[in-house]
Interface confidence: low
């Protein structure tokens, strides 16, 4: 092959980084460079020498080398927030190249404490019992106390304390959130005894009252989301779903969900009504299929929601963004490395997907032109491109026995996104592929059937 | 679903040591943070040590530099080495574990007795 300089990719986790590990790691990768001469180092966005840094062997792959470099930084240091990213920087006999590689935003956040009372004919059994329910959410880093007083003195039986998740988010620091019950008998509740969730967090303490005499008249809270048709779902499933999500419903038996059109013509629409939530309100969702060409051609949906306990009906519209640039993925695929091939345990094979524009994205591996179960795989979220705005880069991990890989078995990724011309592109590889092959097709559907 | 499987407890003389193991099974594709904790009678369960999917452990401050967390990532599976074990590290240890994306989920081993004498 013919020299060339190597192109740069920052490696971050596709998780922010926990905060209470003692340092983060993020990675450079470089890639399709030739003479194997390469040199990593790594600075600060102030241009001062970064020291912790592990380097990995380059690896031979059509004819051109790829290799990556490591940093640890001390999570303390992350965590001021001082620098967003910092700089990989190479050098090579064909050009020198640098990398911004942003860093997993570490934050302590508070934690916001709810107490949610049971309804009035919300106590069962003998004797009649029912449960507070007190959520801290938002906060960080994980460790956190929870602890119930029953009029200032401490509660010691009764109490479930779930363990601590962490909230679904698609950027920002990463937040946590934990549920602790309160098992109340009737008549303490209505003899007006005042119950407090007590949450201890980063050395401060949080506490949120309840009781009979303190419950406000239930207000309409009921709120209106109007989700659109993910990319993923009409590829897979060949129909533009709208999907209506009605929340805080005290009641169910009233509420009616419909979608109409531009032109006020009503779309038929399918409404499930979900079981009581822990907060004693339901949820329903109302979905109507309406034709792909009208949604991109930008056509208005009005989701209209009505409940008895509605003054008026709430309506919220959507339709297709405009003026979106549509930029088609690049994708990589990355043999085993051999450092883990030698130890032979388990092979991991990476689909990295790049440059692409909206960050609807869909991933699939194939093998032996069957899809593999995801349970095989895991697939980050897009993240932005650092330096190209409004960009965005994925990657995808499959991983297979040592065993399996050696036997010469091809494993195909299938990335699918609507900038591409037919929707879809692959690429396959396997023990003797040193490239990769690619392939732009269309007519996947007996794909996706299963 | 994520089953967790602990072994390795039991019963030590002051100074001695132990070594935990726990395997994850089931849907244990997206395992990211493997790790122990422990609760001793009529405290809360507390951090012990935990290693994340890219090898960086943490640890307690009262088992720093006497335990060693490890982990084997093609058999899914997070061991504690205890040593110089001491009557406070008396607790039922719990294997623990988080799985999925973007949600991640907690997952939680039935716990394993650790009883040091003095």
């Known amino acids: 092959g013919s020299a060339s300089a190597p192109t740069l990719f920052p490696l971050v986790s596709c998780e922010n980084s926990p905060s209470d590990t003692s340092s983060v790691a993020v990675g450079c990768l470089a890639q399709d460079f030739l003479p194997d001469s390469i040199t990593f180092s790594w600075k600060y966005k102030n241009n001062s020498d970064i020291s912790s840094t592990r380097g990995f062997p380059s690896v031979l792959r059509g004819g051109k080398y790829a290799a990556t470099s490591q940093v640890l930084l001390p999570s303390k240091d992350v965590m001021q927030g001082t620098d967003e990213h910092v700089v990989c920087k190479v050098q090579h006999p064909n050009g020198n190249k640098e990398k911004n590689v942003p860093l997993p935003v570490i934050a302590e956040l508070p934690p916001k404490v709810s107490v949610f009372v049971p309804p009035r004919d919300g106590f069962f059994g003998n004797p009649r019992k029912s449960k507070l329910i007190c959520q801290a959410t938002g906060f960080s880093p994980r460790q956190i106390q929870v602890s119930w007083l029953r009029e200032g003195k401490q509660v010691g039986s009764g109490v479930t304390t779930d363990q601590v998740q962490a909230e679904a988010k698609e950027s920002g620091p990463t937040t946590y959130k934990v549920t602790s019950t309160l098992t109340i008998k009737e008549s303490d509740w209505l003899g007006q005894s005042m119950f407090t969730c007590r949450v201890d967090h980063r050395g401060l303490t949080f506490q949120q009252n309840a009781s009979s005499m303190c419950v406000p008249d239930q207000d309409t809270a009921i709120r209106v989301f109007a989700i659109p048709p993910s990319f993923a779902s009409i590829f897979l499933t060949k129909s533009t779903k709208l999907t209506c999500l009605v929340t805080d419903l005290t009641t169910y038996d009233s509420v009616t969900i419909s979608w109409t059109r531009q032109n006020g013509e009503a779309v038929k629409t399918h409404t499930n009504i979900s079981e009581s939530h822990p907060n004693a309100t339901f949820s329903a969702v109302g979905e109507a299929s309406i034709c792909e060409d009208d949604w991109n051609s930008g056509e208005r949906f009005t989701c209209t929601v009505t409940h008895t306990d509605l003054p008026s009906p709430l309506k919220q519209t959507i339709s297709r963004p405009k003026g979106v640039a549509l930029h088609r993925p690049d994708v990589y695929l990355l043999p085993p490395a051999r450092e883990q091939l030698n130890l032979r345990e388990s092979a991991t094979i990476t689909c990295l997907v790049t440059g692409f524009s909206p960050a609807d994205v869909f991933v699939q591996w194939m093998q032996r032109g069957q899809p593999l179960s995801p349970e095989k795989y895991v697939t980050s979220a897009p993240m932005p491109e650092p330096q190209a705005p409004g960009r965005y880069f994925a990657h995808s991990i499959l991983t297979v026995s040592e065993e399996e890989w050696n036997t010469g078995e091809t494993y195909t990724c299938v990335v699918a996104h609507e900038a591409l011309p037919n929707r879809v592109t692959e690429r396959t590889v396997d023990k003797s592929t040193e490239g990769e092959v690619s392939a732009d097709e269309e007519g996947f559907e007996n794909l996706w059937a299963t | 679903c994520v089953q967790l499987l602990e072994s390795g407890g039991g019963l030590v003389q002051f100074g001695g040591s132990l070594r935990l193991s726990c395997a994850a099974s089931?849907?244990?594709?997206?395992?990211?943070?493997m790790g122990w904790y422990h609760q001793a009678p009529g405290k809360e369960r507390e951090l012990v040590a935990i290693?994340?999917?890219?090898?960086?452990?943490e640890y307690a401050a009262s088992v720093k530099g006497r335990f060693t967390i490890s982990r084997d990532y093609a058999k899914n599976t997070v061991y504690l080495q205890m040593n110089s074990l001491q009557p406070e590290d008396t607790a039922v240890y719990y294997c623990?574990?988080?799985?999925?994306?973007?949600?991640?989920?907690?997952?939680w081993g039935q716990g394993t007795q650790v009883t040091v004498s003095c």
């Open positions: 089931g849907n244990s594709f997206s395992i990211s943070n």
């Open positions: 290693i994340t999917s890219g090898g960086v452990a």
């Open positions: 623990h574990c988080e799985s999925g994306f973007p949600t991640l989920i907690a997952y």
